[in-house]
Interface confidence: medium
């Protein structure tokens, strides 16, 4: 029989032959034979994998390093990851949470409507038509666009809510 | 190495202005939001104010709004208070401070004192 060129869900593709992928949490020994099925173990502790897998090594659960205000939300097994979250009153400084900051900053777009306090975190608010942000900031609010016609120009470019307006020179008409 | 220097304090009357200033130095004074605080005699530190990184934005604690106003220099790297209608409860060592995202203030300076007084 001609040998396959593509194999069913949960298969791949080796030595012209269709081998059946290592189940999630476990790592690949072996590739399978015309005789032998493929050869799997499971991954050892602190080790995951989280898909149907042609892989030799298993992942490394993600550390939560309590130097960086992290802490264990949810522990790992042998099909997830560690999932990491911050300290009491810290913050995620993304959504994988790597590290914690102790007040949250507002991304470029958005601004500060309230800054943080002992209590509360940073309060952030996306900038209204007019108003742009072009950092990422504990403090900063959003800021105006500039008024190109105070200063008798005309706009350029139209401003967004990460971007300040772009004013030029008018065009005069010539004689 | 990060510095702070506070300079511009002194006795003054009640009523009566000054300006206090903080040369900084060792860090990207241009991208860091930077506060004043302040410790009268025998208390704890107290929040006065916050400057934004582009001065744009700047907050106020409820006890001086209204008399006080922080601004920056950024080609001088500077920070400055204007301090005015001056109380004696306005009596204080003055300390300006450093935005880390990580730990929130950090870096002061040695402080400039402040005394109001007739």
């Known amino acids: 029989p001609e040998p396959p060129t593509a194999c069913r869900e949960k298969q791949y593709l080796i030595n012209s032959q269709c081998c059946s992928l290592c189940q999630p949490g476990q790592k690949l020994v072996s590739d399978c034979t015309e005789f032998t099925e493929t050869e799997c173990l499971p991954c050892g502790e602190s080790e995951f994998l989280d898909t149907w897998n042609r892989e030799t090594h298993c992942h490394q659960h993600k550390y939560c390093d309590p130097n960086l205000g992290l802490r264990v939300q949810q522990k790992g097994t042998s099909e997830t990851d560690t999932i990491c979250t911050c300290e009491e009153g810290w913050h995620c400084t993304s959504e994988a949470c790597e590290s914690c900051v102790l007040h949250r900053s507002c991304s470029p777009g958005f601004g500060v409507k309230q800054i943080a306090t002992g209590v509360s975190d940073t309060i952030c608010e996306p900038c209204p038509v007019g108003f742009f942000s072009n950092v990422s900031s504990a403090f900063e609010k959003c800021h105006p666009w500039t008024s190109c016609e105070t200063k008798d120009l005309v706009v350029q470019q139209a401003g967004t809510n990460k971007t300040d307006v772009v004013c030029g020179p008018q065009d005069r008409l010539r004689a | 190495e990060v510095q702070l220097l506070e300079s511009g304090g002194g006795l003054v009357q009640p009523g009566g202005s000054l300006r206090l200033s903080c040369a900084a130095s060792g860090f990207t004074f241009s991208a860091t939001p930077m506060e004043w605080a302040r410790q009268a005699p025998g208390k704890g530190l107290e929040w006065v104010s916050t400057?934004?990184?582009?001065?744009?934005?700047?907050y106020y604690a409820d006890s001086v709004k209204g008399r006080f106003t922080i601004s920056r220099d950024n080609s001088k790297n500077t920070l400055y208070l204007q301090m005015n209608s001056l109380r004696a409860e306005d009596t204080a060592v003055y300390y300006c401070?450093?935005?880390?995202?990580?730990?929130?203030?950090?870096?002061w300076g040695q402080g400039t004192l402040v005394t109001v007084s007739s």
């Open positions: 401070a450093k935005w880390n995202s990580t730990t929130g203030f950090d870096y």
């Open positions: 400057i934004s990184e582009s001065g744009y934005s700047t």
